[in-house]
């Protein structure tokens, strides 16, 4: 069967929403009211990978765009990027590992760990309007916890 994809939005633990910042970058900032319409809607695909009750492998595409979050090495450092793909071939059940995140939910905390780079997580800064990035620390200054709102 083809891969199942569901639409959702994300907010970090500080309640910052994610919006586009240029063509290939996301940033996190507080939005209210009408401005919430600016937030990115993800198409979250349930992909092949190691799975448990708390951990589900997913790919995070941008709704109605052929862009996916992916994790690559840049200057020897794991880096989060938005990567353009051929819409005829994506999403698919067997996504390349750079596109796969382990969606981990424990005790009201939702994290997205890179499958390509274990212990590296989708992260936001405490500061407003800073880029979403791949971070290698949890529980520090940077935010790795999110909530997810599914949408029609």
């Amino acid at each position: 069967a083809p891969v199942r994809s569901l639409h959702c939005t994300l907010r970090d633990a500080q309640l910052k929403s994610l919006v586009m910042s240029g063509p290939y970058e996301l940033k996190a900032l507080h939005l209210q009211g009408q401005d919430l319409e600016q937030q990115v809607v993800f198409s979250m695909s349930f992909v092949q990978g190691e799975e448990s009750n708390d951990k589900i492998p997913v790919a995070l595409g941008l709704k109605a765009k052929n862009l996916y979050l992916s994790c690559v090495l840049k200057d020897d450092k794991p880096t989060l990027q938005l990567e353009s793909v051929d819409p005829k071939n994506y999403p698919k059940k067997k996504m390349e590992k750079r596109f796969v995140f382990n969606k981990i939910e424990i005790n009201n905390k939702l994290e997205f760990e890179s499958a390509q780079f274990p212990n590296w997580y989708i992260s936001t800064s405490q500061a407003e309007s800073m880029p979403v990035f791949l971070g290698g620390t949890r529980g520090g200054q940077d935010i790795t916890d999110f909530t997810m709102q599914f949408v029609s």
Partner: antibody, heavy 119, light 107 residues
Framework: EVQLVESGGGVVQPGRSLRLSCSAS????????MSWVRQAPGKGLEWVAY????????YYPDSVKGRFTISRDNSKNTLFLQMDSLRAEDTAVYYC????????????WGQGTPVTVSS | DIQMTQSPSSLSASVGDRVTITCRAS??????LTWYQQTPGKAPKLLIY???TLADGVPSRFSGSGSGTDYTFTISSLQPEDIATYYC?????????FGQGTKLQIT
């Protein structure tokens, strides 16, 4: 025995609030996504709220978004549905059900609690 | 949103009859389909998920089949306790929606 027991239903005036509870037993509550499904008198079924096993994921259809809030207390094996700004069209039997977004189907249901919104 | 249409909306059959209910989705739901039984005054009960997998404890006279947009629910030999309303539900894309139900009566 796996069981879900709802409470908190009743008759309420339009615009008022009501809080439903669902007590779970016989399974490890904190490992399961949970939902509320309602059934208007003589009508079919409508999925009205979802919460993931840890509470970090939620869903509401447009018909209740901004008025209903689902929450859970895993330490007390209890699911809640806070219903505000109630309307006549919210009149229904409300069922607590085990399951949600990922699994997609509802494999355990409570007996239901009736909510009537009327002036 | 994907709409689910069940047919017939009601039907009468005799004990021992083979009974078939159909459910049509407005789009391809790739077997992400469930069937529930609701007896009068009771909560729904899961019978079948993933279009054809029988839930635990469900008698083997119940079965499901289909693919794409068209799905079928069958009771191979109707029993008196099968008097109920049957609902299909898809879970391919949010919102997961239910069919309007098929009320089954015994003649």
């Amino acid at each position: 025995e796996v069981q879900l027991v709802e409470s908190g239903g009743g008759v309420v005036q339009p615009g008022r609030s009501l809080r439903l509870s669902c007590s779970a037993s016989g399974f490890i509550f904190s490992r399961y996504d949970m939902s509320w499904v309602r059934q208007a008198p003589g009508k079919g079924l409508e999925w009205v709220a979802y919460i993931s096993h840890g509470g970090a994921g939620t869903y509401y259809p447009d018909s209740v978004k901004g008025r209903f809030t689902i929450s859970r207390d895993n330490s007390k094996n209890t699911l809640f549905l806070q219903m505000d700004s109630l309307r006549a069209e919210d009149t229904a039997v409300y069922y607590c059900a085990r399951g949600g977004v990922y699994k997609g189907y509802f494999d355990v249901w409570g007996q239901g609690t009736p909510v009537t919104v009327s002036s | 949103d994907i709409q689910m249409t069940q047919s017939p909306s009601s039907l009468s059959a005799s004990v021992g009859d083979r009974v078939t209910i159909t459910c049509r989705a407005s789009g391809n739901i790739h077997n992400y389909l469930t069937w529930y039984q609701q007896t009068p005054g009771k909560a729904p009960k899961l019978l079948i998920y993933n279009a054809k997998t029988l839930a635990d404890g469900v008698p083997s006279r119940f079965s499901g089949s289909g693919s794409g947009t068209d799905y079928t629910f069958t009771i191979s030999s109707l029993q008196p306790e099968d008097i109920a309303t049957y609902y299909c539900q898809h879970f391919w894309s949010i919102p997961y929606t239910f069919g309007q139900g098929t009320k089954l009566q015994i003649t």
